[in-house]
């Protein structure tokens, strides 16, 4: 950074709100496609450029013009694997964070024309090409279809889809959200003769309703009404099938093959948690209790002279725990050997650390190939002769990311491949292989400028820089920017990391304010080495206010001893933590103690919240957005997960001993902001709601702002500008700031 | 690669009954269907029946009460039963894989003359 | 059921010809008719699926079109090989039924 180190002789200007909300610094990104072991697409100029990965050469695989008849604006595209397809998506319609439906047209790249007959329906809510040549399946008023070629007719697989009741092939609201992170529940087998499908089935499932008020001309408003189990409630219910989509025909219906959950599951509720194929007639499952600490794998073979797909009891994996929950989030999925006869998988080891373990098929037990005090993040490829994997090992920093390569015949063998690139600028890599994993982009998020690069996988040496984001660093270079720290401290023997964000020319000796921003939700991770423009940016720069986030426990990467001490007890450690690194933060000698906020959304509104409400004395203000204000309103699978169910035989005193309202009283010691949209279909505006009433009902003065129409993300253009201004008042006006 | 191949009796008497098998490779029969088509001499091509990867069977109206056709997976063997033989039953019966919606592999044929 | 009704019956012609052969169905099919042919003592073989798509191995002289009611299968070049009976069918629904069948002869 030029300049000098006194901020009075910065002539720069500084990171601004409308720097922010304007996006006027923006990042570089290099986002490719492979389609196939050396090439991959790229869209530059809107031209789709194939990429040769060795040379770098590259062709305009389709151009700009190719669509200027279209009369549509494409939304996205997807390749056939085999190349001589292009499906379009346009008519784009938003439903929840991944759900969306849209209307699609084929455009054969051999004839250079698009299909005309047989075309998808408008508002189809998913489609897939089979991951080898050029089939499609899709879904449509929730039931599914398949497509051999795509002028041919349509193959109906399910019939029994019905809106909010019964879902083929895609999910419903909680498994959405919860489960898959996707609106899919299709898998192809790997050479596309099977297709496996899940339907979910919500006849019995509460529904949410709230008013959307849609245009002012709208007399009255609108009702959504959305099937939401909330803790305690009725969940949905799961079946899987698999078809075999060579046996379609138009004049007999499509036969679907179902495989039940283990017995083990079917004695009460359950989940599907993980659908993947081991071969072109192995298929693996992995079920959850609704009690989330016991989960069956489940590996399908099919049977042909039956047609039916057998689970050997003899080859079911269980995996448990019992100090928390399975999985970060839900059961890891495996990584299979190409004979399907083994595979990879990240579960928790004895002392509690998540690492690779290697299982076969056959035998119960399994053998840890990587050990430590840290955590392997993700298993990005599998080759006969390598793994590779996403660990925080290096330097023992839980906030960093690393690509490191195993060798299969010498667990011994490992080789980090990202660490010592470059050092200084990149500590935190993310990567996306070629299809057999001959080549590799690897995309550095930070503690610099992102980076792309892109690597051969048979000497690990580094082929070509991408995007080195060079503009940017020079628009930058005349910018107060922020400096970033990433530290732990130490309480009970144990670290805790956090991060600060500290404003151009910072000096110890001098008193800033401090606002925390907190999330510290379950495996959450907010210090990190993430390079972000953001809001806190600008109060950085601008403001010169620190922004803090702390990782207490409760928080993820760093072992389960810290992950699961909030098990069954949500809104306890983890809301003392904060307040406890707010008083660490401030003997550093460089806060302001008079001047320290708290603000979260989400799980961080509800934490917020609770910091602000438990009278700690160390927070002058802070702002909620879309909290969580008691846990019996959100959703089943999250809640239950970490919380077990609202019963007297379970865990309902914990339940009602951690909501915001029992702590109404509190608040009127601190200034406090709530934030919530009212169209939120995640964390329902019940929620604030409810606070609001228990605020109301004791006398507590507050602020609060609503977003009429507004879902979780508080995301349309306006709104996120609106928001962000009024905070950032919000924020001045608690610091006294001009 | 795919063969399908008919074995029948040749010659069958009037009222008496067909048998028929089918003998595949090269695909299983849990996955494609397997139609039986017949030719009458000098005649063109009649449909009969299928019977689907799943066992499901379909048969044309006027064949129903007369014709049967089952399968063994295992032995990739398809059978097909016609009983109450006449005259006008004489042609060459085809066992047919169903690729979706179309024939994609035929058999040889095998030629029935009903006569006593 | 559904009726196929073929034209002509018969054709005679010589090598290099242009051959049309039309295939009616007694109500609308969309695209679900095939084309065969059929040389004697001989199975028919699969040429045309789909009213248009040309099965695997079949030379591009074959060609299919129509929908709905009325198809049509034409042999753009006749090559001496081409001299069979060819056979439209239809597979939108049960009973499957073939038409009555063209057979195509050398002049």
């Known amino acids: 950074n030029k300049g000098t180190d006194d901020a009075t002789a910065d002539s720069r200007k500084t990171y601004t709100l409308t720097d922010y909300l304007k996006n006027t610094y923006r990042l570089k990104l290099y986002s490719l496609r492979w389609i196939s072991d050396h090439e991959y697409l790229y869209k530059q100029e809107n031209n789709i450029l194939v990429f040769n990965a060795e040379y770098g050469n590259s062709s305009v695989f389709l151009e700009n013009s190719t669509f200027d008849e279209f009369g549509h604006s494409i939304n996205d595209y997807s390749i056939s694997p085999d190349g001589q397809f292009i499906l379009l998506e346009y008519n784009y319609v938003k439903q929840w964070r991944h759900s969306y439906t849209a209307s699609y047209d084929i455009y054969d790249l051999n004839k250079r024309q698009l299909i005309t007959e047989e075309r998808i329906p408008n508002n189809t809510q998913w489609v897939t090409w089979s991951p080898v040549g050029h089939k499609l399946a899709y879904v449509w008023n929730n039931d599914i279809y398949v497509k051999i070629e795509p002028n041919l007719p349509s193959y109906r697989i399910t019939w029994t889809g019905k809106e909010d009741i019964i879902y083929n092939g895609i999910t419903d609201w909680v498994y959405e959200e919860e489960v898959f992170s996707a609106y899919s529940a299709l898998w192809w087998s790997p050479n596309g003769t099977f297709l496996a499908y899940a339907q979910f089935n919500d006849t019995e499932v509460p529904l949410i309703e709230y008013s959307f008020y849609s245009d002012e001309s709208l007399q009255y408003p609108k009702t959504v009404r959305v099937p939401y189990p909330k803790a305690g409630a009725v969940n949905p219910t799961v079946k899987f099938f698999v078809v075999n989509t060579d046996s379609l025909s138009s004049v007999t219906n499509a036969t679907s093959i179902q495989i039940t959950a283990p017995a083990s599951m079917l004695i009460g509720d359950h989940y599907l948690c993980d659908v993947t194929w081991a071969t072109q007639e192995r298929i693996s499952l992995q079920w959850l209790r609704r009690i989330q600490n016991y989960s069956v794998m489940d590996i399908c073979d099919y049977d042909e002279s039956s047609g039916r797909w057998n689970c050997l009891v003899a080859r079911q994996h269980i995996e448990m725990s019992t100090t928390g929950w399975v999985g970060r989030f839900r059961p890891s999925e495996p990584h299979f050997t190409l004979d399907g006869n083994s595979f990879y998988k990240i579960i928790s080891n004895e002392e509690g650390y998540r690492h690779i373990c290697y299982f076969q098929i056959d035998k119960k037990d399994c053998t840890f190939i990587t050990k430590g005090t840290w955590e392997v993040i993700g298993i990005e490829a599998l080759t006969s002769d390598y793994l590779y994997y996403i660990s925080n090992e290096y330097k023992g920093m839980p906030g960093g990311r690393n690509l490191y390569k195993i060798q299969l015949s010498d667990y011994t063998k490992v080789t980090c491949l990202s660490c010592e690139l470059n050092p200084e600028r990149c500590q935190y890599y993310s990567v996306s292989f070629s299809k057999e994993a001959k080549y590799y982009q690897l995309r550095c998020s930070g503690p610099g400028l992102p980076l792309y690069t892109l690597h051969s996988s048979v000497n690990d040496k580094g082929l070509r820089v991408l995007e080195d984001n060079s503009a940017l660093d020079k628009m930058l270079q005349n910018v107060q920017m922020p400096s970033k720290k990433l530290d732990f401290i130490i309480l009970n023997e144990t670290k805790f990391w956090y991060q600060m964000i500290l404003p151009p020319h910072f000096d110890k000796s001098k008193k800033y304010p401090l606002l925390l921003d907190v999330y510290a939700g379950p495996c959450s991770q907010k210090a990190d080495t993430v390079f972000r423009l953001n809001w806190a940016t600008y109060l950085a720069s601008t403001e010169n206010i620190i922004v803090a986030s702390f990782d207490g426990r409760g928080s993820g990467y760093q072992g389960d001893k810290i992950m699961h001490a909030i098990n069954r007890r949500l809104g306890t450690f983890e809301v003392e933590d904060q307040i406890e690194a707010a008083r660490q933060f401030s003997k550093m000698g460089f806060v302001d103690n008079k001047r320290i906020a708290i603000w979260g959304w989400s799980y961080g509104g509800y934490v917020t919240s609770m910091v602000l409400g438990s009278g700690s004395g160390v927070f002058k203000c802070g702002i909620a957005v879309a909290p969580v204000s008691r846990w019996e309103y959100y959703d089943s699978v999250y809640t239950e997960r970490y919380m077990g169910l609202p019963t007297p035989e379970d865990n309902l005193d914990h339940y009602r001993n951690s909501t915001v309202m029992s702590r109404a009283e509190n608040f009127k010691q601190v200034e406090y902001l709530l934030i919530h949209g009212t169209a939120d279909d995640n964390v329902h505006f019940q929620q604030s709601a409810q606070i609001s009433k228990a605020l109301v009902d004791v006398g507590v003065d507050f602020q609060a702002m609503w977003y009429t129409d507004e879902d979780h993300g508080i995301a349309s253009s306006t709104a996120h500008q609106h928001i962000y201004t009024h905070m950032s008042h919000f924020i001045k006006q608690c610091f006294s700031l001009p | 690669q795919v063969k399908l191949q008919e074995s029948g009796p040749g010659l069958v008497q009037p009222s008496q009954t067909l048998s028929i098998t089918c003998t595949v490779s090269?695909?299983?029969?849990?996955?494609?269907?397997v139609h039986w088509v017949r030719q009458s001499p000098g005649k063109g091509l009649e449909w009969l029946g299928v019977i689907w990867g799943g066992g499901r069977t379909d048969y044309d109206a006027a064949f129903i009460s007369r014709l049967s056709i089952s399968k063994d997976n295992s032995k990739s063997q398809v059978f097909f039963k016609m009983n109450s033989l006449q005259a006008n039953d004489t042609a060459i019966y085809y066992c047919v894989r169903n690729r979706h919606d179309w024939f994609d592999y035929w058999g040889q044929g095998t030629t029935v003359t009903v006569s006593s | 059921e559904i009726e196929l009704t073929q034209s002509p019956s018969s054709l005679s012609v010589s090598p290099g010809d242009r051959v049309t052969i039309s295939c009616s169905a007694s109500q609308g099919i969309r695209n679900s008719l095939n084309w065969y042919q059929q040389k004697p003592g001989q199975a028919p073989r699969l040429l045309i699926y789909y009213s248009s798509n040309l099965h695997t191995g079949v030379p591009a002289r074959f060609s299919g079109s129509g929908s709905g009611t009325d198809f049509t299968l034409t042999i753009s070049r006749l090559q001496a090989e081409d001299f069979a009976t060819y056979y439209c069918?239809?597979?939108?629904?049960?009973?499957?039924?073939f038409g009555s069948g063209t057979k195509v002869e050398i002049k």
């Open positions: 090269g695909f299983s029969l849990t996955t494609y269907g």
């Open positions: 069918q239809q597979s939108i629904k049960l009973p499957l039924t």
